[in-house]
Interface confidence: low
């Protein structure tokens, strides 16, 4: 339906407060080297003339689009040019140009200093003080971060980091209480960050139709007693939404996502018997809730797959007469009998299925050419299942940071060219699947594991299409959404690396690391972990763990030192040339 | 590889009892929904009762409702069938599938009732 004023429609059923978090977090996203106060400015100038729009539609401008009125303000900045360079030729573009030359601009690691959390009662004060301001900082520093974020979980967000200090401020114990909560908030808002970069990056990089695809099959398996109908009338409504926060349009994704929520509420009894505590919480918690909740268990009366998708003699009938909607069905069918596959797993066997149907449909006997196409299946589900056991026993073996270590080594030698930040934080996600997803009973395991293996990979696959510098990424990144972890697993050492130059700065080390939190000592270890495997990529296991052995104990050694500068300066001297030696350098 | 082995069956008097068991194994058990199946001589399979992954939601045929109950232990990886109340036409080898498959994976169990 058709509305005068496309702003005051959004203004009235969002509500102020809404509205105004959410314009601020599409602006943030944009500009992410604005400062805060700038960006309240314009909040609150857009927010007046909603307002204006809302009291008449029929006022000046109020019949402008969304892209056109935000790209109009973001386009006053003053030091657009100076900050952010080419991005201010965006402005001289119409819409809808102007907004995809805006989206081709956000930045995955923009360069921001990384957040300092203060101290509890500096943090507290500031709370008391300006809840509003302090909230609305919250929104900007996450969402200029994290330029894809999803715009109305991070509502959902803001609103547990409220009550986080709600609480807590005034307990007896205020950090005891508050740092958990932050910790959790902050885990898991970086988790949420991965997670819808991958869909958002499923959609512009390979379309609606692989959004599609990925979506039947999890609600599928989400929802296994709906009715293929259903389930796709869900796909079409939630792919709506995705497109729409991945495209910058944060006021209609938030609305048509309370929608979809309230559809699915209304009619859980044909969709989902998990759904009941949800439906009874608050709109943000309960879209949160529908997102995240646990399949549904499988009907009792599921017939066998082959009857319609191999014995039958009408599949290539059938499949000639609605491609996509055949090939729905069956990931539907699939999907809901097997909540043990990851969704890459599934969809991998749906385009096997197709690839079999298009050379089979058009041959001689074609109900002979596909009799054997679920034995093709076979070697596609033992792979991960293989895989998974493998890595598992190896995590088990050698807990979390070892773990780490191993992956370090394995993705440094396979795509040595990467930069040494990038390869320390992606091995060190894909190291956290074993605590994630190890504890887990086999029927959980492969979903777990694969498809958050998946969302880590596309974080190293968006950072390097920022500075494409392996050929092997770009290709395992490009070729095929579903088969980026088999791509990345096959590989092998990068044979045509040329070893970086030794440099001994790069394992030089100060007193400071002894402060650093066990976290941060980590890093800094596994980055000269990434570094000697640079200089040395025929170095075996042995020999890296004898280093950093030694490296762990050189660090410890200094840092119960009285003088540790001056330890670390001679010994670490000590240690480079014990190194050198070790590996050969 | 999966494997679906039954137990339980045997000759038995009409009005009697018999427990039949299935153990599976080489899949994730407690993922799937089972069947019990029957075959009777010289007769097509035919679907006699289901249960959900979770064993929440049970289905039976007609013929024998009210009489069998379906149940699971997905700790023990285990379907079971309790039958009472039997009659001579409940003469039929009993298996176990997954889903609601009527098509046979296994060697099945002989349930004969007869006075």
């Known amino acids: 339906d058709a509305h005068k004023s496309e702003v005051a429609h959004r203004f009235k059923d969002l509500g102020e407060e809404n509205f105004k978090a959410l314009v601020l977090i599409a602006f943030a996203q944009y500009l992410q080297q604005c400062p805060f106060e700038d960006h309240v400015k314009l909040v609150n100038e857009v927010t007046e003339f909603a307002k204006t729009c809302v009291a008449d539609e029929s006022a000046e401008n109020c019949d402008k689009s969304l892209h056109t009125l935000f790209g109009d303000k973001l386009c006053t900045v003053a030091t657009l040019r100076e900050t952010y360079g080419e991005m201010a030729d965006c402005c001289a573009k119409q819409e809808p140009e102007r907004n995809e030359c805006f989206l081709q601009h956000k930045d995955d690691n923009p360069n921001l200093p990384r957040l300092v959390r203060p101290e509890v009662d500096v943090m507290c004060t500031a709370f008391h003080d300006n809840e509003e301001t302090f909230l609305k900082k919250y929104l900007y520093e996450i969402a200029r971060r994290h330029p894809y974020f999803y715009a109305p979980e991070l509502l959902f967000f803001a609103k547990r980091y409220k009550a986080a200090f709600t609480e807590c401020c005034q307990a007896a114990d205020k950090a005891a209480c508050l740092l958990p909560k932050l910790d959790e908030l902050r885990d898991e808002g970086k988790a949420s960050s991965a997670k819808q970069r991958l869909k958002c990056a499923s959609l512009q990089k390979f379309g609606e139709r692989a959004f599609k695809a990925w979506a039947v099959a999890r609600l599928s398996q989400r929802f296994p007693k709906a009715e293929f109908a259903e389930v796709s009338k869900l796909v079409t409504d939630l792919t709506k939404v995705h497109t729409e926060c991945c495209h910058g349009d944060l006021l209609e994704c938030a609305d048509d996502r309370a929608d979809l929520a309230k559809y699915i509420c209304e009619n859980q009894d044909s969709i989902s018997s998990k759904l009941k505590e949800c439906c009874e919480k608050p709109l943000l918690e309960k879209s949160h809730c529908i997102a995240e909740v646990e399949n549904d268990e499988m009907p009792a009366d599921l017939p066998s797959l082959a009857a319609d998708f191999v014995e039958s003699k009408d599949v290539c009938k059938n499949y000639a007469e609605a491609k996509d909607v055949f090939l729905g069905m069956f990931l539907y069918e699939y999907a809901r009998r097997h909540p043990d596959y990851s969704v890459v797993l599934l969809l991998r066997l749906a385009k096997t299925y197709e690839t079999t149907l298009e050379k089979c449909c058009a041959a001689a006997d074609p109900h002979e050419c596909y009799a054997k196409v679920f034995d093709e299946f076979k070697p596609l589900v033992e792979e991960p299942q293989n895989l998974i056991k493998q890595n598992c026993e190896l995590f088990e073996q050698l807990g979390e940071y070892k773990f780490q270590n191993a992956l370090l080594v394995r993705y440094t030698k396979k795509v040595p060219q990467v930069s040494t930040p990038t390869l320390v934080e992606v091995s060190r996600n894909l190291g956290k699947v074993g605590s994630k997803c190890c504890k887990h009973p086999e029927a959980k395991r492969m979903p777990c594991a694969e498809d958050y293996l998946s969302v880590v990979l596309n974080q190293l696959c968006v950072l390097h299409e920022k500075t494409p510098v392996s050929d092997r990424v770009t290709k395992c990144c490009t070729e095929s959404l579903v088969n980026r972890r088999p791509c990345f697993s096959a590989l092998e050492v990068d044979e045509t690396y040329v070893p970086k130059e030794f440099n001994a700065e790069t394992f030089t080390f100060h007193a400071d690391i002894c402060t650093l939190s066990e976290k941060e000592r980590q890093i800094k270890k596994q980055t000269a972990l990434v570094e000697l495997v640079k200089h040395k990529p025929k170095a075996t296991k042995e020999q890296l763990k004898a280093v950093m052995d030694d490296f762990a104990a050189f660090v410890e050694k200094c840092c119960k030192a009285d003088d540790k500068e001056t330890c670390f300066a001679e010994e670490g001297k000590k240690l480079v040339a014990a190194s050198q030696a070790a590996l050969g350098l | 590889e999966v494997q679906l082995v039954e137990s339980g069956g045997g000759l038995v008097q009409p009005g009697g009892s018999l427990r039949l068991s299935c153990a599976a194994s080489?899949?994730?058990?407690?993922?799937?929904?089972m069947s019990w199946v029957r075959q009777a001589p010289g007769k097509g399979p035919e679907w006699v009762s289901a249960i959900d992954s979770g064993g929440a939601d049970t289905r039976y045929a007609e013929s024998v409702k009210g009489r069998f109950t379906i149940s699971r232990d997905n700790a023990k990886k285990t379907l079971y069938l309790q039958m009472n109340s039997l009659k001579p036409e409940d003469t039929a080898v009993y298996y176990c599938?997954?889903?609601?498959?009527?098509?046979?994976g296994s060697q099945g169990t002989q349930v004969t009732v007869s006075s």
């Open positions: 599938t997954i889903g609601r498959s009527t098509s046979r």
């Open positions: 080489g899949f994730t058990f407690g993922s799937f929904g």
